[in-house]
């Protein structure tokens, strides 16, 4: 057979679908690998072929499109399961070819079981919403293309295992779920169950979104350095261990990169000859505000070390902050100048 452009296994597309539910999977070739769409390819005389490798097998085999009730079918560039079964799990390949051209890609498909409370190994998308913001809407995801616009499905929303009925600030509106002045107590997994008829059968689609209520942009601030501060003096004798925590509060800012670093006499720790250890820890509040602590330690401090200028720096998308630590040698009666 002719050479085929093999894009390998596209692990970026870890497709997960629920057992006993419809699934429509588009061939990734047209979405990520080729410059043209299916219609163009088809009109140019190219054919799309599907095959698969079962879980824990090496043998590629054709997909059986002659199952009862057309359980698996292909429509244009979409592979349909109506519905899935657990043993449909495997690596699926779509190949586009004619006598002179061939291109193919494989992708993993995992059929996942769920319990009556929608608990499963499924990875859910996370929707972040701002605390106390006016109205946030989430939309039941990934249901496009399952039924025609003429079909009006029934939609039921759940928080965890509980159907959302008379929730005070959460209102189901068909495919949408509206949150009014959200609070941290609105955090959780929200599931929509979409039920629609097709050829005399009822199908269910289950989709879950994890809601995380986060700090509002109106509360966003530049970094706030809690420690070091002007009230604490690190007074040490030569030979003792010097430990200075740099503790910084970052309010939640979407996609912000929060940084904390030390300078010693204006240089990064890696650029000085002092034997310094820096350990970092991070904790988060309920609204994903971040407290980042970098502990600078010198096991056996020298008189020279006690004359150095130790400055904690912090930066986020709102600004920068810096604060010098007050370090002095025990008993010599003077604090070194802390000019920045």
């Amino acid at each position: 057979s002719e050479r085929c452009d093999d894009w390998g296994l596209d692990t970026m597309r870890q497709i997960q679908v629920f057992e006993d539910e419809p699934a429509r999977i588009k061939c990734p070739l047209f979405e990520h690998f080729l410059k043209y769409n299916y219609s163009t390819a088809h009109s140019s005389g190219l054919t799309l072929i599907w095959y698969w490798t079962r879980q824990d097998r090496d043998l590629e085999e054709p997909i059986n499109f002659r199952l009862p009730e057309n359980r698996i079918s292909k429509e244009k560039d979409v592979l349909w399961f109506r519905p899935t079964l657990l043993n449909d799990t495997g690596n699926y390949t779509c190949m586009l070819r004619n006598t002179t051209y061939c291109s193919k890609v494989a992708f993993p498909l995992e059929v996942v079981q769920k319990d009556s409370c929608f608990n499963s190994a499924m990875r859910f998308p996370v929707h972040k919403m701002y605390i106390e913001h006016g109205i946030h809407k989430i939309t039941c995801p990934n249901v496009d293309g399952y039924f025609p616009s003429s079909v009006k499905p029934s939609v039921t929303w759940y928080k965890g295992c509980t159907e959302i009925v008379d929730f005070h600030n959460v209102l189901p509106e068909g495919m949408n779920l509206s949150f009014f002045i959200p609070l941290v107590s609105n955090n959780g997994n929200y599931t929509c169950v979409v039920t629609y008829p097709e050829n005399g059968r009822l199908f269910h689609l289950t989709r879950t979104v994890t809601v995380k209520v986060v700090g509002s942009p109106k509360d966003a601030l530049p970094p706030q350095i809690y420690s070091p501060n002007d009230r604490v003096v690190y007074e040490k004798e030569p030979g003792e261990e010097l430990v200075i925590p740099c503790k910084v509060y970052f309010s939640f800012i979407m996609d912000s990169h929060n940084e904390v670093w030390w300078t010693i006499d204006g240089k990064k720790p890696d650029d000085v000859t002092v034997d310094i250890t820096i350990n970092e820890s991070v904790s988060y509040s309920s609204t994903e505000d971040e407290t980042r602590t970098q502990i600078l330690s010198i096991k056996k401090v020298t008189p020279e070390d006690l004359r150095r200028n130790y400055v904690c720096h912090a930066r986020n998308t709102k600004g920068e902050a810096e604060q010098a630590a007050k370090v002095k040698q025990k008993g010599n009666g003077c604090t070194e100048p802390m000019t920045l």
Epitope: E132, H133, G134, I135, H168
Partner: antibody, heavy 118, light 107 residues
Amino acid sequence: EVQLLESGGGLVQPGGSLRLSCAASGFTFRDYAMGWVRQAPGKGLEWVSAISYDGEGTLYADSVKGRFTISRDNSKNTLYLQMNSLRAEDTAVYYCARFHYRSAFDYWGQGTLVTVSS
Amino acid sequence: EIVMTQSPATLSVSPGERATLSCRASQSVSSNLAWYQQKPGQAPRLLIYGASTRATGIPARFSGSGSGTEFTLTISSLQSEDFAVYYCQQYNNWPWTFGQGTKVEIK
């Protein structure tokens, strides 16, 4: 200094309407969610309504839902409560209060008395 | 909705004594609980938020504790100006709800 000053209370007949106002000063009004809390004579406190800082989100106690409307004008630093179809059980002192998810109702107005009676 | 229950309804205490007020939530409110003081003819005043953080300007004799469903407001040494009605309020879930109040009176 944070100040909240309610006005618009008074005597009204059952079925009537009243509009309460709350003038805010001493803080950035548009940055805070606001609420109304009422207190019937000799009784405890009851949350009535809340509005988000941007004015888009509103919430109501079941006892007033469909009859009361909360709104705000951030350009005027003013909070409103439109009260329709008033009932005798709505008789209370109505307080406007600033709130924040960390610190609850941290500042209150002095209140305005609404009396619903024929 | 979350029901807040305060006890006792009335607490008789002598000036200088310690007063302990309780508040129970019908379900967990985490640490999202506030305490207010109200004197006759006045608006409520925030004392404690986050179950244990004193609001600005509140004397150190007022302290709050608890989380989840059980909360306590303690006034370590009652002053004459502390005789008032105290309300707890949860702000974890909508609708925000208040306890029915505890009246602290002079013994």
